[in-house]
């Protein structure tokens, strides 16, 4: 699920995807929910 581009000599360019944080108790100034597990 990550997007990584490479120049021909293999140097990685760009950033991998950054999931948006979930704030399940949005009505509080809170810490973000831990990212869901990758499968």
């Amino acid at each position: 699920s990550y997007s990584m581009e490479h120049f021909r000599w293999g140097k990685p360019v760009g950033k991998k995807r950054r999931p948006v944080k979930v704030y399940p108790n949005g009505a509080e100034d809170e810490s973000a929910e831990a990212f869901p597990l990758e499968f």
């Epitope: 699920s1 581009e5 760009g14 948006v20 944080k21 704030y23 009505a27 990758e38």
Partner: antibody, heavy 113, light 112 residues
């Protein structure tokens, strides 16, 4: 109380510009991922762009090159600068705290001559 | 951009019915999938995140499943308050080459 209040919508001519504001209370905008979402009349939700907590911004294809998301930490406010507006940009614009129930009430932008 | 395809676009059902809405992502998004409910003139309400985790205060008749590209929202026994429009949302996030925060087209659940 945690809330988001959008402002700055209105009638603008095609090709014009508008800056929307999203004032946050009850939390610090710069500590959270924030998304702009719009909804054309009678249509579905469309994500426009995101500003991550570290300030990085990314845009949907429909917004890239025309729209810019920024924030003013001293005012605890998020902005959406919209340029080269088209009729199809007519919508209610919402700011959203990440994935959550914290949405603004929306502000209507009408692009028409 | 990630494309989210929802089906059906409209669903006619009766109180007590079991309702299933599907959402397909154009590429794998792991389980970074949320479901929202929206009623006319209101902002959307978060129902489910991480594909299957119920948001606070959401009735247990709502459930979500799936991972990768195929996801499902199920309402086990439709209640009068459930007639609304439902949206799936990918929040896998973005990279320099692709925007990964997208909504499905919506499913309107109406009274049969």
């Amino acid at each position: 109380e945690v809330q988001l209040v959008e402002s700055g919508g209105g009638l603008v001519q095609p090709g014009g510009s508008l800056r929307l504001s999203c004032a946050a209370s009850g939390f610090t905008v710069s500590k959270y991922d924030m998304i702009w979402v719009r909804q054309a009349p009678g249509k579905g939700l469309e994500s426009i762009g995101i500003i991550y907590d570290d300030g990085d911004t990314y845009y949907a294809s429909s917004a890239k090159g025309r729209f810019t998301i920024s924030r003013d930490n001293s005012k605890n406010t998020l902005y959406l600068q919209m340029n080269s507006l088209r009729a199809e940009d007519t919508a209610v614009y919402y700011c959203v705290k990440g994935v959550s129930n914290i949405w603004g009430q929306g502000t209507l932008v009408t692009v028409s001559s | 951009d990630i494309q989210m395809t929802q089906s059906p676009s409209t669903l006619s059902a009766s109180v007590g019915d079991r309702v299933t809405i599907t959402c397909q992502a154009s590429q794998s998004i792991s389980n970074y999938l949320a479901w929202y409910q929206q009623k006319p003139g209101k902002a959307p309400k978060l129902l489910i995140y991480s594909a299957s985790t119920l948001a606070s205060g959401v009735p247990s008749r709502f459930s979500g499943s799936g991972s990768g590209t195929e996801f499902t929202l199920t309402i086990s026994s439709l209640q009068p308050d459930d007639f609304a429009t439902y949206y799936c949302q990918s929040y896998e996030g973005s990279s320099s080459s692709s925007y990964g925060v997208g909504f499905g087209g919506g499913t309107k659940v109406e009274i049969k």
